[in-house]
């Protein structure tokens, strides 16, 4: 035996120690970042450590305290909102959450001017929502499912909407399928830019049917929660658009904006509101089947005291492929004519990228091009237009933040973020203040994520904002694992993954694989972030490698990988998890024996189907909250990419694509189904279906439910979770405890 | 009840301004728009262009943009006309008109008309 | 613009019968919540008096036997029993788009 001196015996690596379960569970490796709160083109509110709202003005370097903690403290404030004339600020209290975005919680509005509580007309409680007009210190808010108005915080409201119902109609909020698969917000209300319209969405639930589950709490009877929600091929809400004058709110009261004829000639969906001017405003609708878009330029008629959208301002766009756009359709981002856009959709070759609409979208010019996707439009000024795309290296899972100037001719592209800190940052989201004058970076990783604040028209970095240094620190004595992000090619499709590795690997010998899996549709996993998380804890101190694989169906690779799993989910997804498993074993250091699969949501959905595919592969695997059947899932979200659940349209893939017609194929493999009984959005019934059918089949199974928490198995929840998924995992891989 | 009662007629030579006036009674001035509108002698009606007294806002037939400018005085609920670089095709009956509540560009109430005659 | 053509230019027709006239638009002055087409009468000297707005909504104090219809491009307004006031002069106005515009009038005279 020859003895070579090892890094062990280093003393510096004496004191590194493997991340724990306990790490991971206390957050004790989360690391923070810094958004500004914009409040004019150099100044932003950000809320210090000690809890004081505090304005930052870039230009003179000075900063003050707007708001004291003690004022927050008074009212037990968790968050807070200044008025655009700041005169006055709201403390939201009381929080209490809803579904994914939406909550209540108590409004007190704090007037700046004489350091007192706005007295007289207070706010009813609880608020589902409110906010400033863009101008001023006009307050709109929804109580009860009603609108309500109001001139000045101390002023009487007015009463804008008067059919509000629990349940039934909602206004200027979305209702559950609305705010989960179609605005992604807690509201569905939209000031104009100078705050002389409102606009808002009413949704009409009355005919949804209703899910209905048990809620156990702490008496003697548990409650139901009922949800209108509409699962495939059931009712839908019935939304209608309307606009107020909030300047005479009683004169002609509010006027609903037209759907465009193409549109409304069948069932169809609201997509969202972007304001252009006082009064223009773009709406974008959506056929039923979502493979038709409808983008519609309306224009206040000040002799009709309503809404014109002419046939000529109506702006198609069809996927012929696959369904219209990526996760949702894309919004446009109006140039300064108040007309024009730059919007990101499929291009010729079937790539997303940005093009310029100035009258038809035939006519659209393309503004970038290539194989990789432009993902996100943040801001277009008179001479620049800033963009985030995965171009860079031709990295999918990056994000670098380009700059378009438009002012010139033939326009100019510059890479913003490439070079700045190119091993630490490779994944970049931006913020910018008005008219972009300064813009803040935000950098997720591969390294400590980093904040920056930059000039918006040098690109200069001015201060950094945040580095994690304390993480940083932290990170010193843990033995980390390694990362590597890399792709298969298999029969002409390219399949990246990102794969962690135990700190000692060592590529001569064999370890149990993991395989993380999301897989939905527009998803994507392999993404170059920094994060210490669960998977992170399995690497380090239980020595498996876990890896994650976008397949057939996942995002910014182009259509041809996106759309592939058009009316077929539950196929191609779950080949590729396993083509890629077979390609890792070839590689030599993976133990056959000891392969897992593991999935949330629709991953559980994919897990399920993995273990289940009869392969012989996987020893054993989990599925958290995962869906059973497409025929138990939301219309908007389930339809989008399935198409309907009738004979004459998709009924028979419904059918084939559940976990229950594979009951038998789990005979053969360990299994763990886990699902919190309070399910708001994968229902419980998914799990419960599962569960039946493994039964009924008398197949043996392992099962925990978490009763009265929804589909993020939340707070102590979380602990007993992954504690338990480890227990099972290391059984599986005959690893000591 | 509603009533626009407009000024007398009036004689002008080629290349003069006439300002032409109408005042409004029995409804809130402020929230109905006034439309102008002129008839030649033995012709059909010709839309002048609008005026929006509480928000301010005003849109002119392209033909007369830089000729015309429409006013109003909410103090005393009239809305005025002014037509200047007079020409002897502008000699027409001139009216005001209130937009209809309902009638989404329909003129619900009129005045009586003021005769300009342009003459050199 | 939307330019309106009436015809006929001139309808002669005795008290007590029907009078229909027609009003064409160039383009359509419908959306899907109205038809954006409004009616006048205007007697010699007087100013232009509405009957129907919005194509076919009677405007107050108009006797019924006055009545519009259409949508699109084209409309009509109808007279179902002429009484010697309704001799005159009815102009049709559109308001869909700006310029708002008129057309040129058709003359309903006594036989």
């Known amino acids: 035996i020859v003895l070579r001196p090892s890094r062990v015996h280093n003393s510096e690596e004496n004191t590194m120690r493997a991340l724990t379960l306990k790490d991971i569970l206390n957050g004790t490796f989360s690391y923070k970042t810094f958004f500004p709160n914009w409040i004019s083109g150099q100044e932003y509110l950000h809320q210090s450590a000690d809890n004081n709202i505090v304005l930052y003005n870039i230009e003179t370097g000075q900063s003050y305290t707007i708001l004291s903690n003690r004022t927050m403290k008074s009212v037990n404030a968790s968050n807070y909102g200044l008025s655009p004339d700041r005169q006055f600020v709201y403390l939201e209290s009381d929080y209490s959450k809803l579904w994914r975005y939406s909550y209540t919680a108590t409004y007190y509005i704090y007037d700046l001017s004489n350091g007192e509580f706005v007295r007289g007309n207070e706010l009813p409680r609880p608020i589902q929502y409110l906010c400033w007009s863009p101008v001023g210190s006009k307050l709109a808010y929804v109580y009860q499912n009603n609108i309500y108005l109001k001139q000045r915080p101390g002023d009487p409201p007015f009463q804008i909407t008067f059919n509000g119902r629990e349940n039934k109609i909602f206004n200027g909020i979305p209702d559950w399928v609305y705010e989960e698969e179609m605005l992604a917000t807690k509201y569905a209300l939209w000031w104009s830019p100078n705050g002389k319209f409102l606009a808002y969405a009413e949704f009409n639930d009355t005919d949804i049917p209703v899910i209905a589950y048990s809620y156990y709490g702490d008496e003697q009877y548990p409650r139901t929660i009922n949800i209108p929600y509409p699962k495939a091929g059931a009712k839908n809400p019935v939304v209608r658009i309307f606009i107020i004058d909030t300047t005479y709110p009683a004169y002609v009261g509010p006027q609903e904006v037209p759907v465009p004829a193409m549109i409304a000639s069948s069932d169809y969906y609201f997509s969202w509101l972007t304001w252009v001017t006082d009064e223009r405003v773009c709406l974008q609708w959506l056929k039923r089947v979502q493979n038709v878009s409808v983008l519609s330029i309306c224009d206040f008629r000040e002799d009709w005291q309503t809404w014109d959208c002419p046939k000529t301002q109506e702006h198609i766009e069809e996927s012929r492929t696959g369904w219209a756009g990526g996760f949702f359709v894309s919004t446009p981002v109006f140039s300064y004519d108040a007309i024009s856009y730059y919007k990101i959709f499929s291009d010729k070759d079937g790539y997303k990228h940005i093009h310029y609409i100035k009258d038809t979208v035939e006519n659209a010019i393309q503004i970038t091009s290539g194989k990789w996707e432009a993902i996100n439009i943040f801001r277009v000024t008179q001479d620049s237009l800033f963009y985030s795309s995965n171009e860079f290296e031709e990295y999918p899972g990056r994000r670098n933040i380009y700059r378009i100037s438009i002012g010139s001719y033939p326009p100019s592209k510059k890479c913003v973020t490439c070079h700045l800190r190119k091993e630490r940052c490779q994944y970049y989201t931006a913020s910018f203040s008005d008219y972009a004058k300064y813009y803040a970076l935000v950098c997720y990783g591969p390294g400590i994520p980093i904040s920056t604040l930059h000039d918006g028209r040098t690109d200069q970095e001015i201060k950094i904002l945040e580095e994690n240094k304390e993480l940083e620190n932290a990170l010193k004595n843990i033995q980390l694992p390694k990362e590597e992000i890399k792709k298969l090619e298999v029969d002409e499709i390219t399949l990246w993954y990102k794969m962690i590795l135990p700190p000692q690997f060592d590529r001569s010998k064999k370890y149990p694989l993991l395989i993380q899996v999301y897989g939905g549709p527009c998803s994507q996993s392999v993404r170059s972030v920094f994060a210490v998380n669960w998977i992170s804890y399995l690497a380090s101190k239980e020595g498996m490698v876990i890896a994650l694989v976008d397949g057939r169906g996942t995002a910014f690779q182009g259509d041809k990988l996106l759309y592939a799993v058009y009316r077929k989910l539950g196929v191609y997804e779950v080949e590729d998890q396993i083509t890629a498993v077979r390609k890792f074993i070839e590689m030599g250091f993976i133990d056959e024996k000891r392969i897992a699969i593991w999935g949330w949501s629709y991953g559980g959905y994919v897990s399920s189907l993995a273990l289940a595919s009869g392969t012989g592969l996987f020893k054993c695997g989990i599925a958290v909250a995962p869906v059973s059947s497409w025929e138990y899932y939301a219309s908007v979200y389930t339809e989008r990419f399935m198409g309907l659940p009738t004979k004459d349209d998709n009924l028979e893939h419904y059918k084939n694509s559940t976990v229950m017609a594979r009951a038998e194929y789990f005979r053969n493999v360990d299994y763990l189904l886990i699902h919190g009984t309070a399910d708001d959005n994968v229902h419980f019934q998914n799990s419960a279906q599962i569960a039946k059918a493994l039964v009924n089949a008398q197949v043996d199974f392992q099962a925990m439910w978490y009763s009265d928490q929804n589909h993020g198995l939340s707070g102590l929840s979380t602990n007993h979770l992954y504690t338990h998924m480890t227990h099972f995992l290391k059984q599986c891989f005959s690893l000591s405890d | 009840q509603v009533q626009l009662v407009q000024s007398g007629a009036e004689v002008k030579k080629p290349g003069a301004s006439v300002k032409v006036s109408c005042k409004a009674s029995g409804y809130t001035f402020t929230e109905a728009i006034i439309h102008w509108v002129r008839q030649a002698p033995g012709q059909g009606l010709e839309w002048m262009g609008w005026?929006?007294?509480?928000?301010?806002?005003?849109k002119y037939a392209q033909k007369l943009q830089g000729r015309v400018t429409m006013t109003t005085d909410t103090s005393t609920s009239t809305a005025y006309m002014e037509l200047r670089s007079l020409r002897s095709d502008d000699t027409a009956v001139y009216y005001c008109?209130?937009?209809?509540?309902?009638?989404?560009?329909?003129?619900?109430?009129w005045g009586q008309g003021t005769l300009v005659t342009v003459s050199s | 613009e939307i330019v309106l053509t009436q015809s006929p230019g001139t309808l002669s027709l005795s008290p007590g019968e029907r009078a229909t006239l027609s009003c064409r638009a160039s383009?359509?002055?419908?959306?899907?919540?109205?038809?954006?087409m409004h009616w006048y009468q205007q007697k010699p000297g007087q100013a232009p008096r509405l009957l129907i707005y919005?194509?076919?909504n009677l405007e107050s104090g108009i006797p019924d036997r006055f009545s519009g219809s259409g949508s699109g491009t084209d409309f009509t307004l109808t007279i179902s029993r002429l009484e010697p006031e309704d001799f005159a002069v009815y102009y049709c106005?559109?308001?869909?788009?700006?310029?708002?515009?008129f057309g040129q009038g058709t003359k309903l005279e006594i036989k």
């Open positions: 008109a209130r937009h209809g509540g309902t009638g989404r560009g329909a003129m619900d109430y």
């Open positions: 383009q359509s002055v419908s959306t899907s919540a109205y038809s954006y």
């Open positions: 106005q559109q308001s869909r788009e700006l310029p708002y515009t």
């Open positions: 005026i929006h007294p509480g928000s301010g806002s005003i």
């Open positions: 919005l194509a076919s």
